[in-house]
Interface confidence: low
Amino acid sequence: DAHKSEVAHRFKDLGEENFKALVLIAFAQYLQQCPFEDHVKLVNEVTEFAKTCVADESAENCDKSLHTLFGDKLCTVATLRETYGEMADCCAKQEPERNECFLQHKDDNPNLPRLVRPEVDVMCTAFHDNEETFLKKYLYEIARRHPYFYAPELLFFAKRYKAAFTECCQAADKAACLLPKLDELRDEGKASSAKQRLKCASLQKFGERAFKAWAVARLSQRFPKAEFAEVSKLVTDLTKVHTECCHGDLLECADDRADLAKYICENQDSISSKLKECCEKPLLEKSHCIAEVENDEMPADLPSLAADFVESKDVCKNYAEAKDVFLGMFLYEYARRHPDYSVVLLLRLAKTYETTLEKCCAAADPHECYAKVFDEFKPLVEEPQNLIKQNCELFEQLGEYKFQNALLVRYTKKVPQVSTPTLVEVSRNLGKVGSKCCKHPEAKRMPCAEDYLSVVLNQLCVLHEKTPVSDRVTKCCTESLVNRRPCFSALEVDETYVPKEFNAETFTFHADICTLSEKERQIKKQTALVELVKHKPKATKEQLKAVMDDFAAFVEKCCKADDKETCFAEEGKKLVAASQAALGL
């Protein structure tokens, strides 16, 4: 399937609009600090060049790889050294090392200003004045803040973003129409980014085998009627798509994702009965819909797993002949029978099964040795079940905000060295598991909760990797992908931590807190809570609750005062003194 010109091939396959959008995303994900106008200029130059190659694939440079073409273009940026420092050294390298170098410099937490949403009329005017620039700017701003965002999915978000403005800017009440849609896109976008970040971390840190195992388990749950050969084919194709996107090969990724969606729809009768509606949609919606499709019903009368994987005398023979295929079949058979398990639990079971076979197939009596392997699964299954039960009870008792606070305290005590903004962000997201998953019946709770927690803990891992401060975080993040959550759950209070010096400035608040949204006000209070725990890691729940209640009362009082700023200054001093006394600081 070799093409004389790769750039011409992708331009023709994707069409000009998608080609330009994907190149813009790729460039913004690599050079996250570059101004919008610079990126647009680079994209236009690449597009014009691609058109010359479409016209004549033998034209000069048209035979170069996309990495070479895009890397050469990025390396023409005049301010590379001043803006990006050592990233400029990448340009001295040859492909493929140059692309690897760019990838290593992607920043999960770039120093960029928060995106502030303008007034609705201002946005609608900008949309009508120049729709194309407005939408490009959306792609650029999201891509540079989320350097691993799944590019073809970002095209889907942009399509919905455009639809929202097209509809709402002509509505009677523009704000009432538009703002909820933008909030929904923002929240879905953050979730999509975090999910994709886990896929990329899985591929980059733990390798293709780990990603394929995840995919076998998830697709087998989703498509339990599909044969193992069918699931294997889908896993191979899906792995290629995500490897490409995580590697910055966004044109190939989008093209291959479209092919995969086409294949799934053309073969839906041997994959899943739930795909019909998805397959009637246009391409971007179709791909998104397939990725989110509900699990198909399990086939009736599936035989017991024990027959093939425990009782059979051929277990070791089958295992020895093709280890990964046999383990893949085990994972497929277990997962299709257990939509009620999280993917990470299924992977732990498969790992336990593999370890048992490695040990037992070398023993004098293998069958005797592995006969009880399924008994070893029981505690592995019960651990997340019990944890979810306890935490859902706590969530129902406290509500989301206070549940987040409980987790903030818990995680700050486990890993107090982690930066306060990271602890607040991660704990708030961990706390969202309650409203996201606890409403589900028991059969859906574990896959919802534990797989969501895997995504959130990966955020902690990638943020911590940028500036490592805790050996415990490093250990939990790097030892085993599937045991990250149990590893963090098992951490107790860090007894080696030396409490932070008390700094009154950290607990000084001003009248600007009164004009913040409820969410932003919560974040301020939760930031203070983390700082309190860092000062007094041995503080009891009751002590912390008393201080936080006083703090809430203080904010409420001063926000109602005529002279707010004076109130915050004077009452703030009293609050700090009272808190120090309450906590024995």
């Epitope: 294949y263 053309e266 073969n267 009768d269 041997s270």
Partner: nanobody, 123 residues
Framework: EVQLVESGGGVVQAGGSLRLSCAAS????????MGWFRQAPGKERERVVS????????YYADSVKGRFTISRDNAENTVYLQMNSLKPEDTALYYC????????????????WGQGTLVTVSS
């Protein structure tokens, strides 16, 4: 040994109908998507129509939509092509093909091919 044997070709007047059959042996028929391709004299081979393994999903080239119908009988290991309102430009050698993994429908995905049956539409 896998065999695909086409039958039902012949000469027909424009506007007339033909039904082609393709009998498969030597493979698990229900595990294969099936397709009909055609090659007119001096032209490249093109995909006309395909049907997925269970028969639930079909593809038709724009040039035959509304005139041709593909169906399969997994019990009989046979795929059929009902051709109505035939036109002179439908004149070609019609090949039956089987694909284990049918994605884009391009020729290279089809693993097994028949020898072809000739369809001639006279005006």
């Amino acid at each position: 040994e896998v065999q695909l044997v086409e039958s039902g070709g012949g000469v027909v007047q424009a506007g007339g109908s033909l039904r082609l059959s393709c009998a498969a042996s030597g493979l698990t028929f229900s595990s294969y998507a099936m397709g009909w391709f055609r090659q007119a004299p001096g032209k490249e081979r093109e995909r006309v129509v395909s049907i997925s393994r269970g028969g639930g999903y079909t593809y038709y080239a724009d040039s035959v939509k509304g005139r041709f119908t593909i169906s399969r009988d997994n019990a009989e290991n046979t795929v059929y092509l009902q051709m109505n309102s035939l036109k002179p430009e439908d004149t070609a050698l019609y090949y039956c093909a089987a694909a284990r993994y049918w994605a884009t429908g391009s020729e290279y995905e089809f693993d097994y091919w028949g020898q072809g049956t000739l369809v001639t539409v006279s005006s």
